[in-house]
Every structure is written in C-alpha cells, then in structure tokens.
C-alpha cells in the first residue's frame, strides 16, 4: 500500500535537520512527506506544540496523472534572525483522516558570543557618594562569565573573579568609565561604556549672616567635588508670601526665582534688592566643570521690618485763635514695614523742642493757653514702624505768636486727647 | 493551567436539537485539535468528532450530518450543533483539547489522544 494509508506507518520521507548558530542568523528547516490522495496541510510544532504564525511555505508534486496517486508535498520553515526564543525541538504534523503524524525531531539551539540583556548606563553622582552599576549577559553556550572595567583597567584578576551583574562603587572622586565584559566558550563581547560624570554634593547648612531690611547675608558649607574645584555657587531666592508653603525637598516654586552667582571661595552671598519684612525661601547649588551639585533644600528666611524712606507729605499748619491745627498724609515713600503711627515735634525760638507721638491719626489741634509771644513756632512730623523712626519732615511755620507773651512754648500748647511726651530731639 | 467548560446540555425531545459550547480562556483553540466525545451510562468514551487547528473536521459515523463541529477563535470557544438528536444520543457529552504533539503516530479518535477534558454536560433526548 502507498505511504500514508497504513496505520502506524509514517508518511514523512524527509525530517527537519539541526541549525546551531549565533544571534541574527536565518536558517530553514525543511520536510518532506510522501501520501496518496489529496496532499494534507503540514503544521510545524515547537517543543511539541503547534506553531500558529510559522513563516513557511508548502509545494507539493504529483507522482501521477490521477488524484489517487501519490503526491510529494515538501514544507519549508524559515528561522529569521535567530533568537533564544527560536530554540527548541522542531517536527512537522499532518492530520490524514483521524491520524496524526509528526515527523523525526531536529533541533535549532543558540550558540555564539555572549549577549547583553543589561548594559551599564551613564549617570551622574555626587563626588565620594557609593552608587551601583548593572550588566547582565547571556549564551547560550553558558556560563557567561563577567569582567568590568574602570577607565579600561580590569577590576577583577580573571572573569567570574569579581563582581558579576551588579558592581559597587564605593565613591569616586573623579569622572570614569566604566564597562563590562562578557567572556564564554564562543569568546568576548563588550558592553557600551558607560561615563559616571562626578559633580560636587549639595552644600551644606545654609544658613543667614545677617539681615537688613532689603538684604541677607547668606552663608554655606561647600560639599566635596572630587578633584574639580568649584568653579561658582548659584544662589536662588523666591518669595513665599503666597500660602505657597514651599517643603523641603517639594518641586521648585511657579514663580520666577531671583538668581544670584556667587565666586568662591568665600561661600558668602549678600542678595539684595529684597523687600523689607518679606518672607522668602532660599537655596543653593555650587558647580565645579563637570555640572551642577544637586539644590540644597528650600530654607525659609525672612527680612527684617525697615524705617519708612521717607517723610510725610503734605504738611499743613494754621492757627485760628487759640489753636493750632497741624494735618498730613502717609509718606509716600516705601514704609518698609507695618506703619505704627506718626511723631510731632515743635520748637520756638530759643525755646527747647518739644515731642508728641500722634499715633495712626494724621491730624491734630494743638490748644494755645495764655497769651505769649514765641516767634518762629516750627512744626515737624516722622512716620514710625517697630523698626524706628523715618526721616523728618522740613519744618513748617506756624504764625508768629502776639508780642508781650511771657511763658513757655510747651506751656502756651496744649494736645488735650493725647498726653504729650516730651524729651529733647537727638 | 488550562481549564475547559462544556454548556448547553439539557433535556430535549426526540428530532429536537441542542447546541454545546465548550470554552476556555487560558490557551487558544486555534492552535489546538479539540474534539467532542460522549458517555452513556455504563459505556465507554465514545468519540464524536474533532477539528484541527486548521479547520479540519471528522465525524463518528454514528453523527455524521445531524452533527456540526465550529469553532470561534474570537471567542476561543467550540460549538457542537446537534440536530435530529434521537434517544440513543443520550450522554454526558465532553469537550476535550490536545496542544501537545510528540510521538509520531496518534488516532485522534482515541481519547487517551487528548491532555484537557471539560466537566461534561448531560443531554438527555426523551422519546
């Protein structure tokens, strides 16, 4: 009886070969079967199971004029670019009837120089702070065994001697490359080389010098950077008036950031042109030539409260009768800091001068008692905040008094709603 | 592990019909020869039919035209479509899968063919 219609008797004349070969490779496997009647699909099986996608192809020949006779059917496989997960037991499969038939095994198998599945990457580290670095390769053939390098020097006697897919480096206190080297049977493959660029650690206890109402003197500790001296520290302040509440270590604030270099050595800074009596947040990062340290975290600073910059305005003085009425208007000049209220002083002619603190009103009626004669009678006024007092005014002239008046000036004046303080003018 | 789940069994009149589903979610019946068997009381495993990963089918004489094997890969589910059905159809009806290929010949009538079975599903034809 023909090939293929007795049971147990297999139909395939030709089985898959072997294919050994490296990463990349493109091989076929081929078989080939011999059956009487119409040609059966052949399906390939790996590790014994059914390959749905397999990239083959089927011609098949007849023996003979009459579709009962026998037929020659040949299904080529082909393996592009060979992968670990193209190893394995290959066989065809042909359903005739009720029956399966599989075909004599061959095997494909991965054999070549060792390939990576974790390569070391570039980074960048603070100078003497340890880190780890990852490599990892595989064969077939196996072992695999791993050599790493430090700027080209072996750090291991032999490969499989040292570190193998996880190196430690302890610090470096310059930048270096580092790769690592995959030995097996087949021989040596070589990862890319990563460089481990070294940068200086972030400064240290920042921390305020001084403060002035529109200035802060602001120090720091410099981190070590390796063999690079540093080169310039970046100092940025923001304003956190906003609710913002900006927490060490959280993202950087949405406002512009004011930016102050700073040479070095000293690691000292004066940043003006602040506000007075304004909260901000302050941070560092100094620079070598190989890149930036990381920012110090944000520290909250505040400048002090000022005197305001300059004097009322405005400044009116009249009498009617027996009184005095003396008004003006909050400086315009920035008051650096919360406005506590305002200073008087008055003085005559060869009479001392006399001091009133007015408080927040800014007008006040000064009663004249008895009838005396002070000539020259002048009136100042200064805007006060905790801070101090802020600059006087020009004097202002009051009406010289009716002659033939004997008493003092500080007696002639009199402020009823408020008590009157008085101490001489420095 | 792969786990197979017949449906659709029941009772049903003499030339009444009935469709089985057998289902699985942990491997593909496209890659797969799944066949149906069935049992009756006190009887061995009978065959029934199968389908091949290529679309082949084959049927038990006993079935062949009431019967219809499909297979809906969408779904990864078989179907057996039984029409005609008479009492001696009467069974526990099993779905049964084979992934797995090795030894160089097999009947694929056999159930000892097969590495995954469904629970069965019951059909009972009255007269």
């Known amino acids: 009886a023909p090939r293929g219609t007795q049971a147990e008797e297999s139909p395939f004349v030709g089985n898959p070969g072997n294919i050994t070969g490296a990463r990349g490779l493109t091989g076929t496997l081929r078989c080939q079967l011999q059956v009487q009647g119409e040609p059966p699909e052949v399906h390939w099986l790996r590790d014994g199971q059914i390959l749905e996608l397999a990239d083959s192809t089927q011609t098949q020949v007849p023996l003979g004029e009459d579709e009962q006779d026998d037929w020659i059917v040949v299904s080529q496989l082909r393996i592009t670019s060979l992968q670990l997960s193209d190893t394995g037991q290959y066989q065809c499969l042909v359903f005739l009837g009720h029956q399966t038939f599989v075909s004599q095994p061959g095997y494909v198998g991965l054999e070549g120089l060792p390939y990576f599945l974790e390569e070391p990457e570039d980074r960048t580290v603070a100078a003497n702070t340890p880190f780890n670095l990852s490599c990892q390769a595989q064969g077939p053939p196996e072992p695999v065994d791993l050599l790493w390098l430090q700027d080209a020097v072996p750090l291991a006697t032999a490969p499989g001697h040292g570190p193998q897919r996880s190196l430690h480096v302890p610090g470096l206190n310059k930048t270096s490359s580092f790769s690592c080297e995959a030995h097996n049977a087949k021989g040596v493959t070589t990862s890319r080389t990563a460089t481990i660029t070294v940068l200086p650690q972030q400064p240290r206890n920042l921390h305020l010098v001084s403060r002035q109402p529109t200035e802060l003197e602001v120090a720091w500790t410099p981190g070590l950077s390796g063999i690079y001296p540093l080169t310039h520290c970046t100092l940025q302040a923001v304003l956190s008036d906003d609710g913002m509440g900006i927490q060490a270590g959280e993202p950087d604030p949405p406002e512009e950031p004011l930016t102050s270099q700073a040479s070095v050595p000293p690691h000292q800074l004066r940043l003006g042109s602040l506000h007075p009596h304004t909260p901000y947040h302050i941070r560092v990062a100094c620079t070598s030539s190989q890149g930036p340290s990381s920012w110090t975290h944000w520290l909250p600073v505040e400048t002090p409260e000022g005197v305001p910059l300059g004097p009322p305005e405005n400044i009116s003085a009249t009498r009617n009768g027996s009184q005095a009425f003396v008004h003006w208007q909050e400086p315009r000049a920035p008051l650096q800091g919360t406005l506590l209220g305002y200073r008087l002083a008055y003085q005559g002619q060869d009479t001392p001068e006399v001091l009133m603190d007015i408080g927040l009103r800014q007008e006040v009626t000064l009663e004249l008692q008895g009838d005396g004669s002070v000539s020259n009678l002048t009136v100042c006024v200064a805007a006060y905040t905790a801070a101090g007092d802020g600059p006087w005014s020009l004097p202002v002239p009051l009406e010289a008094w009716r002659p033939g008046q004997a008493q003092p000036v500080h007696q002639l004046v009199k402020e009823p709603s408020t008590p009157a303080f008085s101490w001489p003018w420095w | 592990q792969v786990q197979l789940v017949d449906s659709g069994g029941g009772l049903v009149q003499a030339g009444g019909s009935l469709r089985l589903s057998c289902a699985t979610s942990?491997?593909?019946?496209?890659?797969?020869?799944m066949a149906w068997f069935r049992q009756a009381p006190e009887k061995v495993r009978d065959f029934v039919g199968f389908i091949t990963n290529s679309g082949n089918i084959l049927y038990d004489d006993s079935v062949k035209g009431r019967f219809t094997i499909s297979r809906d890969n969408a779904q990864n589910t078989v179907y057996l479509q039984m029409n005609s059905l008479k009492p001696e159809d009467t069974a526990v009806y099993y779905c049964a899968a084979k992934w797995s290929f090795s030894s160089g010949y097999g009947d694929l009538r056999r159930a000892a063919m097969y590495d995954y079975w469904g629970q069965g599903t019951q059909v009972t034809v009255s007269s």
């Open positions: 942990t491997r593909t019946v496209s890659s797969a020869v």
